[in-house]
Interface confidence: low
């Protein structure tokens, strides 16, 4: 999906109203320093699609942040704000529904979410300070 | 009405050195970059480097790295741009222009620095 | 560095005409792409950003696509205020860098 046509004021007041916050309470009890950001983003469609891509694409060690409130708010956010967006998404649901149906909270999962922040935050303050 | 208002035209001599300011009204400071691009006479635009208002982190091109200073004034909104060891070379116009994404939505009018002996 | 090559670098036409002027990355660039429009005195102006979406207050006659590595501005419609010179350039990371220009002049 090319991001680059979403409402970037839109999402980013989405963020800061709802989502920011179901990512602090999901990473509680987490120190902010136990996991170094390794993922990077240039501009704010480029952060979408590393965001969508963290967010909802399964991987090894943590299979069920899909679930989760701010994966769900991310998802309407950008349904609403991205046009075309919700088309792109039927297979992507389909995973979903297959993922694990109880919430596992894994150490793989807490540092995905750790990385998840640092693309919002990046989000909102776009552009590499290096290539 | 998102302004950016840049300093008056310089004259000054090989070796010596030049601030040009760039002052921002009409947004929040703090939310965009500031990036400076300079024109030779007759020439295209080249893209000298970035400074982060809100930290006042800056990126610069290889060339001018030993060169050039960029700094902020965040209680007067004003980003400055200080070039050193001035050559016949760096005649150009200088401009400032704010960005989110990369791409310059506002810039200033423009600072002629002529460096001539 | 990514090096941005524009062509033409000058070109003669009438008003009414189709202008296409084209930017070629040398690397992908996505549509981290934005074009510029800067007359004689005067700093540059957007036009276009993200390879394709209108800057506020541009005309519709400006366009801007995209295939793979190669960018166009086309202008559908010559009119006298777009004699000018227009610049392509990536925004996709550091160094930002920009194409050499096109001059657009009066045929």
């Known amino acids: 999906y090319d991001f680059t046509n979403c409402d970037f004021e839109k999402i980013k007041a989405a963020y800061l109203s709802t989502i920011s916050k179901d990512l602090i309470t999901y990473m509680s009890g987490t120190k902010s320093t136990e996991f170094n950001n390794t993922v990077s983003c240039s501009n704010r469609p480029h952060c979408l699609t590393e965001i969508q891509s963290l967010t909802f694409n399964p991987t090894a060690g943590c299979a069920s942040l899909a679930k989760e409130m701010f994966a769900m708010k991310t998802k309407a956010a950008l349904a609403i704000w991205c046009p075309g967006y919700s088309e792109t998404q039927i297979n992507a649901t389909q995973a979903m529904k297959k993922a694990r149906k109880s919430k596992v909270t894994t150490n793989k999962c807490l540092e995905q979410v750790s990385q998840l922040q640092g693309l919002w935050r990046r989000f909102n303050r776009p552009l590499l300070k290096q290539q | 009405e998102v302004q950016l208002v840049q300093s008056g035209a310089e004259v000054k001599k090989p070796g010596a050195s030049v601030k040009v300011s760039c002052k921002a009204s009409?947004?929040?400071?703090?939310?965009?970059?500031m990036h400076w691009v300079r024109q030779a006479p007759g020439q295209g635009l080249e893209w000298m480097g970035m400074i982060d208002p809100s930290d006042s982190e800056t990126t610069l091109i290889q060339k001018f790295k030993d060169r050039v200073t960029m700094t902020v004034d965040k209680s007067t909104s004003t980003a400055y741009m200080e070039l050193s060891s001035l050559r016949s070379e760096d005649t150009a116009v200088y401009y400032c222009?704010?960005?989110?994404?990369?791409?310059?939505?506002?810039w200033g009018q423009g600072t002629t620095v002529t460096v001539s002996s | 560095d990514i090096q941005m090559t524009q062509s033409p670098s000058s070109l003669s036409a009438s008003v009414g005409d189709r202008v296409t002027i084209t930017c070629r990355a040398s690397?992908?660039?996505?549509?981290?792409l934005a074009w510029y429009q800067q007359k004689p005195g005067k700093a540059p102006k957007l036009l276009v950003y993200?390879?394709?979406t209108l800057a506020e207050g541009v005309p519709s006659r400006f366009s801007g696509s995209v295939s793979g590595t190669d960018f166009t501005l086309t202008i559908s419609s010559l009119q006298p205020e777009d004699f000018a010179t227009y610049y392509c350039q990536h925004h996709y990371g550091t160094p930002w860098t920009f194409g050499g220009g096109t001059k657009v002049e009066i045929k």
């Open positions: 993200f390879a394709k």
């Open positions: 690397e992908n660039i996505y549509s981290y």
């Open positions: 222009a704010r960005t989110l994404d990369g791409y310059y939505d506002y």
């Open positions: 009409g947004y929040t400071f703090t939310t965009y970059w």
